[in-house]
Interface confidence: medium
């Protein structure tokens, strides 16, 4: 921002009424009126170019310093070319000297040269040559000097003529301030520019109404340079929650809008399924039946728990059940749906029921499922099972109601035995099998059926209470089809799959484990 100038003295604006002191009195400097651009202007002028040894002083009135530390002196003046005078005026000069003196009081007409300190010799960039003078072309020069730091109550300026033909048309003395400034939603007060050129005065800003320094952010600061310019902004303020930046201020969010944190972003429209917000809202409340999960951003629409899984099937396969379902028709507006499967088993004889999580095995953990199917195994035969699939999302925990669907299935058969070939010879096959331990108590006997491969007319059956059998009197180097089935009080259990086992050829005789 441009520096603000506070004028302490303005000769040109005073209309010749300042009454500056001349020394020696009545000689040298003289107040004159002229006409420029059809306007009367006043000037202090001296033109004793022929006399030699000039020492003419012009002193300003006493100027109250006020709060100024460094003053700037702007001079507008014209100097005639010494060659424009007859004989070149050998004693003629083309410069004058600028002085100042500080004091705590006005000395009035008591003028003492010794109190004055020289600021500089003032030389023109352009002198007024004869042709310009005759044509009334005033070659106006502008020079600026500065003095500081000033410490006394006031000061004088003085102009020493040493034999020039010079006219002072304007003497303006001012100091600079960094103007009041709003930047980055921070207010910086009007600040007096410092007196030392290299130094920058650090000025703390204050956040405008409804603005705050963001967490972890720097407090707003700026630097007021000696020329009255603000430099090096540091930190900033942001409009607080419920307010947005409009030009250089923070304005409350309009009804129906909200802003949930201090940020540079504008207010946002209330999302879906929220109630209309009042002015200055930091969030928008959810409609009845809709909720916001703790981790949901305020900009997200309010959501609700999902409906139940749309369609659930339970397909029994021996002592296993495959559960399949489709996603809820209403997701509640969320994508974070997970499923939980629970199991209940009932004994047909007694009608007694209880949880069965401990006795069954799931193909994957039954809680927090993201897929829409699961296989449950290790089910007991001749037992009724009820499976519940519950759909949940991020807001389900905020309500007491649950969204679930159930499917029941009766297990009538044991699980097919898993069959292994333990050993073989040219005339025998040793076979073993296993079934899940929970089902073993219900098995009365195991029935082993076997026949030559390719012979569909005859087969042999062996029954045993154990988990293995050796089949004898077999033909060498022959493939047999073997199946094992559990027998329960209620009837036959599920049969194993049919296995092909081959006896050894006579050349490779001897028992060999496989």
């Amino acid at each position: 921002a441009q520096g603000k100038e506070v004028v302490l003295l303005d000769f040109a604006a005073a209309g010749g009424e300042l009454g500056w002191l001349t020394h020696p009195y009545g000689k040298g400097w003289d107040l004159m009126q002229n006409i420029m651009n059809d306007m009367p202007i006043y000037m202090y002028s001296v033109c004793n170019v022929m006399s030699g040894d000039q020492d003419n002083w012009l002193r300003t009135n006493w100027v109250y310093r006020g709060e100024a530390e460094r003053i700037f002196i702007e001079l507008k003046f014209t100097v005639r070319d010494c060659n424009s005078f007859p004989g070149g005026a050998s004693s003629c000069k083309e410069t004058f000297n600028l002085y100042y003196a500080e004091s705590d009081l006005d000395y009035g007409t008591n003028f003492q040269k010794r109190l004055f300190t020289k600021i500089d010799t003032i030389a023109p960039d352009e002198i007024t040559v004869s042709s310009d003078f005759e044509a009334r072309h005033v070659k106006l020069n502008v020079e600026e000097r500065s003095v500081g730091p000033l410490t006394r109550k006031g000061f004088y300026l003085a102009f020493q003529d040493i034999g020039a033909c010079v006219a002072l048309l304007s003497v303006r003395v001012y100091y600079k301030k960094c103007p009041e400034l709003l930047q980055g939603l921070a207010h910086f007060p009007e600040t007096i520019a410092g007196s030392d050129a290299p130094s920058l005065a650090t000025v703390a800003g204050t956040c405008v109404d409804h603005a705050v320094v963001p967490p972890g952010g720097e407090e707003p600061r700026m630097h007021c340079a000696v020329d009255g310019e603000w430099l090096v902004p540091i930190g900033q303020c942001l409009c607080q929650a419920g307010y947005e930046k409009v030009e250089d201020a923070c304005q409350a969010c309009s009804p129906g809008f909200f802003k949930f944190e201090a940020s540079e972003s504008p207010c946002l429209e209330c999302p879906e399924h929220t109630l209309p917000s009042p002015e200055g809202a930091t969030s928008c409340e959810c409609e009845e039946g809709f909720f916001r999960a703790p981790q949901d951003p305020a900009s997200m629409p309010c959501t609700r728990p999902p409906s139940a899984p749309h369609y659930l099937t339970a397909v029994g396969m021996g002592a296993k059940v495959e559960l399949r379902w489709t996603p809820p028709q209403d997701s509640g507006g969320r994508e974070d749906i997970v499923y939980s499967v629970t199991c209940e088993q009932c004994w047909p004889e007694s009608g007694e029921c209880g949880p069965c999580e401990a006795s069954v095995r799931y193909s994957e953990p039954p809680h927090g499922l993201t897929r829409t199917s699961v296989t449950v195994s290790d089910l007991e035969p001749h037992m009724n099972y009820t499976f519940t699939v519950e759909a949940r999302n991020g807001v389900s925990g905020l309500v007491t109601s649950r969204s679930f669907r159930t499917a029941s299935v009766s297990i009538n058969q044991t699980e097919p035995p898993k069959v292994r070939l333990e050993g073989r010879s040219t005339t025998s096959l040793s076979v073993s099998w296993s079934i899940p331990p929970p089902q073993q108590s219900r098995v009365w006997k195991y029935e082993v059926t076997y026949r030559k491969k390719g012979d569909s007319n005859s087969y042999n059956v062996r029954r045993t209470e154990g988990f293995s059998v050796t089949l004898d009197d077999l033909a060498p180097d022959t493939t047999y089809l073997v199946q094992v089935q559990a027998l329960t009080q209620e009837g036959q259990g599920a049969g194993s799959k049919v296995h092909e086992f081959q006896t050894l050829s006579p050349e490779g005789s001897g028992n060999l484990a496989v």
């Epitope: 005078f85 009334r136 006219a167 048309l169």
Partner: antibody, heavy 128, light 107 residues
Framework: EVQLLESGGGLVQPGGSLRLSCAAS????????MAWVRQAPGKGLEWVSR????????HYADSVKGRFTISRDNSKNTLYLQMNSLRAEDTAVYYC?????????????????????WGQGTLVTVSS | DIQMTQSPSSLSASVGDRVTITCRAS??????LAWYQQKPGKAPKLLIY???NLHTGVPSRFSGSGSGTEFTLTISSLQPDDFATYYC?????????FGQGTKVEIK
């Protein structure tokens, strides 16, 4: 010694024309502003026109504007006044006058000039 | 235009007298004023410029003063050669105007 010598005056009928000349010597003519000043018989002085050292700018009194033309030839050290559409009230002694700003010890020139040097004058009579 | 009014229009004085002639401007002309002396049948001669500056070769008994609208020409001790008509002229405006003249006669 500065000398200004006017010529070209005489009797002329109303509506007629006349050209006055002023021969300069004894000074650097091209440094001087030159002017014509007239004086009606038994009356005071009246400024007529001026011309800058190098031929411009020119200014005229309202009473002669559009009828009189001032000019100069610095190579001949001569000032001229061409007078057209003459009227009876133009009857006067016409003086040529000069001003050298180099002798005026002021930092800023006056808005206009005064007259340091004068010729002896030439009489112009406009009559039918 | 700026009007210049001289007073008196004529005066009678004796050799050795102090003579003062006044010139008034219709508006402020600062110090842009000149005084001339004219004898019958002769061209005017410059006496004073810039209200108070004596032209080269003019006797020091002549002096000028004033600024703004009021100006005076003073002859401190009238000499026989001083009997003439005196004119003031303003040169603040390009339409330079003269006063109507003051005739100084022998008493």
């Amino acid at each position: 010694e500065v000398q200004l010598l006017e010529s070209g005056g005489g009797l002329v009928q109303p509506g007629g024309s006349l050209r006055l000349s002023c021969a300069a010597s004894g000074f650097t003519f091209s440094h001087y502003m030159m002017a014509w000043v007239r004086q009606a018989p038994g009356k005071g002085l009246e400024w007529v026109s001026r011309i800058g050292p190098s031929g411009g700018p020119t200014h005229y009194a309202d009473s002669v504007k559009g009828r009189f033309t001032i000019s100069r030839d610095n190579s001949k050290n001569t000032l001229y006044l061409q007078m057209n559409s003459l009227r009876a009230e133009d009857t006067a002694v016409y003086y040529c006058a000069g001003y050298d700003s180099g002798y005026d010890y002021v930092a800023v020139a006056g808005p206009a000039e005064y007259f340091q040097h004068w010729g002896q004058g030439t009489l112009v009579t406009v009559s039918s | 235009d700026i009007q210049m009014t001289q007073s008196p229009s004529s005066l009678s004085a004796s050799v050795g007298d102090r003579v003062t002639i006044t010139c008034r401007a219709s508006q402020s002309i600062s110090t842009w004023l000149a005084w001339y002396q004219q004898k019958p049948g002769k061209a005017p001669k410059l006496l004073i410029y810039k209200a108070s500056n004596l032209h080269t070769g003019v006797p020091s008994r002549f002096s000028g003063s004033g600024s703004g609208t009021e100006f005076t020409l003073t002859i401190s001790s009238l000499q026989p050669d001083d009997f003439a008509t005196y004119y003031c002229q303003q040169y603040q405006s390009y339409s330079r105007t003269f006063g109507q003249g003051t005739k100084v006669e022998i008493k």
